[in-house]
C-alpha cells in the first residue's frame, strides 16, 4: 500500500477539554499539511479526541505517554502489556472518533483507507503495534454504554470522533503520516483464546495483576457524572443490539450540538438492529458542526452500530 505523506487526512475543527492521562493510551500529531496543528489522543476505549498541542495538559500527557512507552521498551523491547485475561466476547465494543475531526481517505487507497484485517477483534488488540492513527475502529471487547458527553463538568463536549465498531474483522484507518513526535504507545492486551460454552453474561471473569508496569486498555464507562443524574440500571447494552448493515450512517455519542454527514456506500444489506432505528444515507443528529468523511466502499468492512443517546437512556430513579 502506498502512503501519501503530505495529504492531510485528519482535520480537527475543535479541541477537546482536559482528559486525565490515566485514561489515554496513545497520541499522534496530525500532519503538517493540515495547517492547524493538533494532537490526536486515543483513550482506553479506543475513542479519539483532538487536543491543542499548546495546552499544558496536552504537553504533560504526551510526556507521560512517552515515558510510559520508553519504560515498556526498556522492560523487554516490546509494547505488549498484560492486562489480565481478556476473554473473547460475543459482542464488539466500539472505538470512537471526535466529531470535530474530518477524515479524508482517498478512494484509491493511496492515503488512508478503512481497511479490514483478517484478524479477529481480540487478535487485533493483541497485535496492535501499528504506530499510526486513527484506529477508532479497533475496538476493545466487552459491553459498555456510551458515556454522556461531559457537559456538566466542562469536559469534552462535542469533540469525540464518530464511532465505527468492529465486527469479526477489526478495521483500522491507516494514517499516512509517520508517528510523531513521541514513540508509539499501543498498549496491547493478551487474550485468552479458550472458547467458553458459558453464556458471557454469567461467565465468571478473572484478572490478575501483572508484573510491575502499568497495563492500559479498556476503561469502564458510565453515562453520568456524580451529582448530575443517577446510574442507569437497565439501559440498553451493546450485546442487546443486533447487527446493523454497513450502509447505514449511524453514529453515536454526539455531544450537544453536532452534526454528521458520512458518505458510506453499502457492502451488504443483511441484519437489522433489534432496538434502534437506522437511517440509510445521511443522518444528522442534533445539528451544529459538520463532519464529512468519505470512505472507499470497496474497503468498508465494518458494521456501524447505533447506540441510544446516553442522556436519553433509561435511568434508575
Amino acid at each position: 500500500q502506498h502512503h501519501g505523506v503530505t495529504k492531510c487526512n485528519i482535520t480537527c475543527s475543535k479541541m477537546t477539554s482536559k482528559i486525565p492521562v490515566a485514561l489515554l493510551i496513545h497520541y499522534q500529531q496530525n500532519q503538517a499539511s493540515c495547517g492547524k496543528r493538533a494532537i490526536i489522543l486515543e483513550t482506553r476505549q479506543h475513542r479519539l479526541f483532538c487536543a491543542d498541542p499548546k495546552e499544558q495538559w496536552v504537553k504533560d500527557a504526551m510526556q507521560h505517554l512517552d515515558r510510559q512507552a520508553a519504560a515498556l521498551t526498556r522492560n523487554g523491547g516490546t509494547f505488549e502489556k498484560q492486562i489480565g485475561e481478556v476473554k473473547p466476547r460475543t459482542t464488539p465494543a466500539a472505538g470512537g472518533m471526535d466529531e470535530s475531526v474530518v477524515l479524508e481517505p482517498e478512494a484509491t487507497g493511496e492515503s488512508s483507507s478503512l481497511e479490514p484485517t483478517p484478524s479477529s477483534q481480540e487478535a487485533q488488540r493483541a497485535l496492535g503495534t501499528s504506530p499510526e492513527l486513527p484506529t477508532g475502529v479497533t475496538g476493545s471487547s466487552g459491553t459498555r454504554l456510551p458515556p454522556t458527553p461531559k457537559a456538566q463538568d466542562g469536559g469534552p463536549v462535542g469533540t469525540e470522533l464518530f464511532r465505527v465498531p468492529p465486527v469479526s474483522t477489526a478495521a483500522t484507518w491507516q494514517s499516512s503520516a509517520p508517528h510523531q513526535p513521541g514513540p508509539s504507545l499501543w498498549a496491547e492486551a493478551k487474550t485468552s483464546e479458550a472458547p467458553s460454552t458459558q453464556d458471557p453474561s454469567t461467565q465468571a471473569s478473572t484478572a490478575s495483576s501483572p508484573a510491575p508496569e502499568e497495563n492500559a486498555p479498556s476503561e469502564g464507562q458510565r453515562v453520568w457524572g456524580q451529582g448530575q443524574s443517577p446510574r442507569p440500571e437497565n439501559s440498553l447494552e451493546r450485546e442487546e443490539m443486533g447487527p446493523v448493515p454497513a450502509h447505514t450512517d449511524a453514529f453515536q455519542d454526539w455531544g450537544p450540538g453536532s452534526m454528521a454527514h458520512v458518505s458510506v456506500v453499502p457492502v451488504s444489506s443483511e441484519g437489522t438492529p433489534s432496538r434502534e432505528p437506522v437511517a440509510s444515507g445521511s443522518w444528522t443528529p442534533k445539528a451544529e458542526e459538520p463532519i464529512h468523511a468519505t470512505m472507499d466502499p470497496q474497503r468498508l468492512g465494518v458494521l456501524i452500530t447505533p447506540v441510544p443517546d446516553a442522556q436519553a437512556a433509561t435511568r434508575r430513579q
Epitope: 482536559k18 492486562i83 489480565g84 459491553t143 463538568d153 469502564g220 464507562q221
Partner: antibody
Framework: EVQLVQSGAEVKKPGATVKISCKAS????????IHWVQQAPGKGLEWMGW????????KFNERFEGRVTITADRSTNTAYMELSSLRSEDTAVYYC???????????????WGQGTTLTVSS | DIRMTQSPSSLSASVGDRVTITCRAS??????LAWYQQKPGKAPKLLLY???TLAEGVPSRFSGSGSGTDYTLTISSLQPEDFATYYC?????????FGGGTKLEIK
C-alpha cells in the same frame, strides 16, 4: 439505589491468601469499574487497582507486586479481590468502590463498600 | 508516581469556624482532584471532584479551589457533623494517589 456490600472480617496467617467479595446492586455491574482501596490501621488510603467486569480489563498499582487477583461473577454482580502471600503489613481495611465517570472524566470514587477488615497475624 | 501531601495533618476548630485544608501534588494534576470525608469506622464519602464540582448531596459550605499542583478544601462554617478526616486524591495519572489525610477535631 447503588450499593456495594462487602464480605465480613478475615483473620489470616502470613503466607496465606484472602479473597474478599463486593456485591454490587442498583446499576449495571458490567459497565463500570470496580476499584479496590487499602487502608492500613491509622494510615491513609492506597489505591490497589481497577477492574471492569464487562471485559475483564484491569490496571493495578505496582506496589502490590502481582499479588492481587480480581475476579467477578457476572451472574451475581459480585467482584472479588484476592491478595496472596499475605504479610503483617497487609493488615488493613479493604474497600471496593466504583468510579462514576465516563472515560474523559477520570476515576474518582463516588460509591464505596462498607469495608472488610483483614488481620494478618501468626 | 504523583505524591500528594496534605496539610495540616490535624486541625482543631470550633463549630462556625472557617477551615482550610491544603493538598499539594508532586506534579501537575490539571485539576483532576477529588476530596473525601471519612468518619471513624466508615467508608470515605466523595465531597468534590474535577474543577471543584460539588458531589451530589454535599452541602454548599464545602468548596474547593486551586490549580496546577496546589489545591485547597474550604469549609465555610463548620458544623458538628463535619468533624472527620479529609483526604484528597489525584486521578490525573495512575497509580491514583491520596493525601495522608487531615484530621479535623473539635477544639
Amino acid at each position: 439505589e447503588v450499593q456495594l456490600v462487602q464480605s465480613g472480617a478475615e483473620v489470616k496467617k502470613p503466607g496465606a491468601t484472602v479473597k474478599i467479595s463486593c456485591k454490587a446492586s442498583g446499576y449495571t455491574f458490567t459497565n463500570y469499574n470496580i476499584h479496590w482501596v487499602q487502608q492500613a490501621p491509622g494510615k491513609g488510603l492506597e489505591w490497589m487497582g481497577w477492574y471492569l467486569p464487562g471485559d475483564d480489563s484491569s490496571k493495578f498499582n505496582e506496589r502490590f507486586e502481582g499479588r492481587v487477583t480480581i475476579t467477578a461473577d457476572r451472574s451475581t454482580n459480585t467482584a472479588y479481590m484476592e491478595l496472596s502471600s499475605l504479610r503483617s503489613e497487609d493488615t488493613a481495611v479493604y474497600y471496593c468502590a466504583t468510579s462514576p465517570t465516563d472515560e474523559t472524566q477520570g476515576d474518582y470514587f463516588d460509591y464505596w463498600g462498607q469495608g472488610t477488615t483483614l488481620t494478618v497475624s501468626s | 508516581d504523583i505524591r500528594m501531601t496534605q496539610s495540616p495533618s490535624s486541625l482543631s476548630a470550633s463549630v462556625g469556624d472557617r477551615v482550610t485544608i491544603t493538598c499539594r501534588a508532586s506534579g501537575r494534576i490539571h485539576d483532576f482532584l477529588a476530596w473525601y470525608q471519612q468518619k471513624p469506622g466508615k467508608a470515605p464519602k466523595l465531597l468534590l471532584y474535577t474543577d471543584n464540582t460539588l458531589a451530589e448531596g454535599v452541602p454548599s459550605r464545602f468548596s474547593g479551589s486551586g490549580s496546577g499542583t496546589d489545591y485547597t478544601l474550604t469549609i465555610s462554617s463548620l458544623q458538628p457533623e463535619d468533624f472527620a478526616t479529609y483526604y484528597c486524591q489525584q486521578f490525573w495519572s495512575t497509580p491514583y494517589t491520596f493525601g495522608g489525610g487531615t484530621k479535623l477535631e473539635i477544639k
